[in-house]
């Protein structure tokens, strides 16, 4: 799976979309999880309604919401009041019983609020040394991760 980068501004909301084959994943619940380390597990953040037919209802876990357009085949995750600690690698998943299919790998980047003059040193920009000039940008907030880019911050 390629990784798609979604950028959001600190303090604002970020909407992440994950398209999928609606027929293949018909009847299956979806989830949003956070990757713990490069080879670590993906920790569930929020999943769609237990009753699949009600997947269109928005479900919240803290500041993260999930809703599923099962006909159109688009899973949408909303991260409200984006914070620097929200930056990192996530996955949209389709649940196959207790197993999960990865629908999309997502790298969330948190940009400093241009109106906020506090120290931006805490903000993490994965692969910030790389050139993003050739990257594909969707809706000006997402793009595919370039080959060779590091989706996790280097550990010192």
């Amino acid at each position: 799976h390629n990784t798609t980068v979604f950028q959001g501004v600190a303090g604002q909301s970020l909407q992440v979309s994950c398209p999928y084959d609606s027929m293949k994943h018909w009847g299956r619940r979806k989830a949003w999880c956070r990757q713990l380390g490069e080879k670590g597990p993906c920790q569930r953040v929020v999943s769609t309604h237990n009753l699949w037919l009600l997947s269109f209802l928005r479900r919240w876990n803290g500041s993260t919401a999930i809703t599923d357009d099962t006909l159109g085949g688009t899973l949408t995750i909303t991260l409200r009041n984006l914070q620097p600690h929200d930056a990192g690698l996530y996955q949209c998943q389709s649940l196959h019983g207790s197993e999960a299919d990865t629908l999309r790998k997502v790298l969330v980047e948190v940009l400093a609020d241009p109106l906020d003059h506090r120290d931006a040193g805490d903000l993490w920009f994965p692969g910030e040394s790389e050139s993003f000039e050739d990257a594909h940008v969707e809706h000006s907030i997402s793009r595919s991760l370039l080959e060779g880019e590091i989706p996790f911050p280097p550990t010192s």
Epitope: W26, G27, H96
Partner: antibody, heavy 122, light 108 residues
Framework: EVQLVQSGAEVKKPGESLKISCKGS????????IGWVRQMPGKGLEWMGI????????RYSPSFQGQVTISADKSISTAYLQWSSLKASDTAMYYC???????????????WGQGTMVTVSS | EIVLTQSPGTLSLSPGERATLSCRAS???????LAWYQQKPGQAPRLLIY???SRATGIPDRFSGSGSGTDFTLTISRLEPEDFAVYYC?????????FGGGTKVEIK
């Protein structure tokens, strides 16, 4: 009419290979997962695995992983179950079945093949 | 894997009587992912109930399903001669999906 038609009964010797088939008709074959279920003589149903003919994505029950291979040829709307080396304990009725999908927004098996009896004996 | 235990193993009843079949799961199962099947001798299984309580197309309303969590029930309100068969429950909430051992409903 939506239906799954399976290949005929087979009598094989231990160690031989076998591939049985399940042909779908009356619906878009690539749009529903197809599963395989084993029923040993006088016993209950066992879920073996499933395949999505649209892209051949496959899932196996741990009990059958490595014992059988599930495949599909979407160009002829057919799913397959195969063994490379049969054992006497593989003697059973094998059913293919369609996951309901769009019909029910559900993952239950709504359409079943008539079954293929496989007998393995020396 | 989730183990489904069906009881009783055999149910001996007369036509016109009410049949109550139980399916108990070793751990909680979402009601969205619990199904019931009927199998007659020499035939393939047939889907009766999906989502624990919804009847499949063409299934008479004398068949009904209920339950949640770990306890599910299939009820046949008035047994017809063609209802004498083996009934299986199945969960597909957890991998791998599993079937119960079956309940045989036989003529008393």
């Amino acid at each position: 009419e939506v239906q799954l038609v399976q290949s005929g009964a087979e009598v094989k010797k231990p160690g031989e290979s076998l591939k049985i088939s399940c042909k779908g008709s009356g619906y878009s074959f690539t749009s529903n997962w197809i599963g395989w279920v084993r029923q040993m003589p006088g016993k209950g149903l066992e879920w073996m695995g499933i395949i999505y003919p649209g892209d051949s994505d496959t899932r196996y029950s741990p009990s059958f992983q490595g014992q059988v291979t599930i495949s599909a040829d979407k160009s002829i709307s057919t799913a397959y179950l195969q063994w490379s080396s049969l054992k006497a304990s593989d003697t059973a009725m094998y059913y293919c079945a369609r996951e309901a999908g769009y019909d029910y927004g559900e993952l239950a098996f709504d359409i079943w093949g008539q079954g293929t009896m496989v007998t393995v004996s020396s | 894997e989730i183990v489904l235990t069906q009881s009783p193993g055999t149910l001996s009843l007369s036509p016109g009587e009410r049949a109550t079949l139980s399916c108990r799961a070793s751990q909680s199962v979402s009601s969205s992912y619990l199904a019931w099947y009927q199998q007659k001798p020499g035939q393939a299984p047939r889907l009766l109930i999906y989502g624990a309580s919804s009847r499949a197309t063409g299934i008479p309303d004398r068949f009904s399903g209920s339950g949640s969590g770990t306890d599910f029930t299939l009820t046949i309100s008035r047994l017809e001669p063609e209802d004498f068969a083996v009934y299986y429950c199945q969960q597909h909430d957890s991998s791998p999906p599993t079937f119960g051992g079956g309940t045989k409903v036989e003529i008393k």
